[in-house]
């Protein structure tokens, strides 16, 4: 039988690398059962993380998983730095792994790179 | 449904580089994550990495300085390069998805035979 | 990488009898809070197919007569009855740690 506990898959050390300017959807995959539990965004400031209170979230249902998604619109420069998503469930505080989000500002780039050869480039 | 589709040469030359491409239909890689895997002649399978949703992507530390996978959105199509290969590369490769619950494979492609050969 | 050590590499079972297959990690499958282990079978000629996710949860679509157990390093699938269907090589993988590895392989045959 599936067991009913609520779990978050941000992968382990998981990176994202994106353009300044463009919009992003970064996804928390929360697994539950009955009833979906309240997920919050943060980002970390050195050991504290700082709840993410007027950001536009949004859930996404797809079998078998839920993702509460923290949107960017659009990417800016101190976007940069490491979330978390954690949710709260039977009194329980479950805390996902972090993810990293590397922003790179198109201002500063002599030239503006498509999304896919930054992504290869930057993760080559 | 999801289905992937992988394509490119059955035969390339030592020190050659491979490159093959996996075309996705019923999903857009823009969501979940896309992997490549090969399965060797005496039946053991590698993982060889993957590109995710945002463009990013992870390789095994074996390959990591032989192996890239980019990525066409518009096409919905993302690809393996292999650089100097050798005979040790011969082997079925597999592109599949991996559900980002749990991060198993739910769907896979049918492979298609590499053999590097002089 | 972790290794995940499947035993026997191969089997031959009657029909209609229990095939049971192991596979041991060499590090606790946990990081999640959950076991991401997982079971695929493969065909002559096919892909693998997922049967088993996330240790004992059933993929759609695949028979009750498969199921998984297991946690931590010490991981089973469970063939019960098998019929001649299910000749195949049985493959256990784990998600739990980059980079993500696979059992050898146990290639079941009928007796």
């Known amino acids: 039988k599936e067991s009913c506990d609520v779990q978050l898959y941000i992968k382990r050390q998981s990176e994202h690398s994106i353009l300044a300017g463009d919009p992003f959807e970064l996804e928390c995959p929360v697994k539950y059962c009955a009833n979906r539990p309240h997920v919050t965004w943060c980002k970390l400031n050195g050991t504290t993380c700082v709840k993410l209170e007027d950001r536009q979230t949004s859930w996404k249902e797809e079998k078998n998983i839920s993702f509460f998604i923290l949107h960017f619109e659009p990417v800016l420069p101190n976007d940069n730095g490491s979330y978390r998503c954690s949710a709260n469930f039977q009194r329980n505080l479950i805390e996902s792994h972090s993810t990293t989000l590397y922003v790179t500002d198109v201002k500063s780039a002599s030239e503006r790179p498509s999304k896919d050869e930054m992504a290869s480039r930057f993760w080559a | 449904e999801v289905q992937l589709q992988e394509s490119g040469p059955s035969l390339v030359k030592p020190s050659q580089t491979l490159s093959l491409t996996c075309s996705v239909t019923?999903?857009?890689?823009?969501?979940?994550?896309w992997n490549w895997i090969r399965k060797f002649p005496g039946n053991k399978l590698e993982y060889m990495g993957y590109?995710?949703?945002?463009?990013?992507?992870y390789f095994n530390p074996s390959l990591k300085s032989r192996i890239s996978i980019t990525r066409n959105t518009s096409k919905n199509q993302y690809y393996l390069q292999l650089n100097s290969v050798t005979t040790e590369d011969t082997a079925t490769y597999y592109c599949?998805?991996?559900?980002?619950?749990?991060?198993?494979?739910?769907?896979w492609g049918h492979g298609t035979t590499l053999t590097v050969s002089s | 990488d972790i290794v995940l050590t499947q035993s026997p590499a191969s089997l031959a079972v009657s029909l209609g009898q229990r095939a049971t297959i192991s596979c041991r990690a060499s590090e606790t499958i946990d990081s999640y809070g959950d076991s991401l282990m997982h079971w695929y079978q493969q065909k002559a000629g096919q892909p693998p197919k997922l049967l088993i996710y996330r240790a004992s949860n059933l993929e759609s679509g695949i028979p009750a007569r498969f199921s998984g157990s297991g946690s931590r390093t010490d991981f089973t699938l469970t063939i019960n009855p098998v019929e001649a269907d299910d000749v195949a090589t049985y493959y256990c993988?784990?998600?739990?740690?980059?980079?993500?590895?696979f059992g050898g392989g146990t290639k079941l045959e009928i007796k």
């Open positions: 599949a998805r991996s559900h980002y619950y749990g991060y198993y494979f739910d769907y």
């Open positions: 590109i995710s949703y945002s463009g990013s992507t």
């Open positions: 993988q784990q998600t739990d740690e980059d980079p993500y590895t």
């Open positions: 019923g999903d857009s890689i823009t969501s979940a994550y």
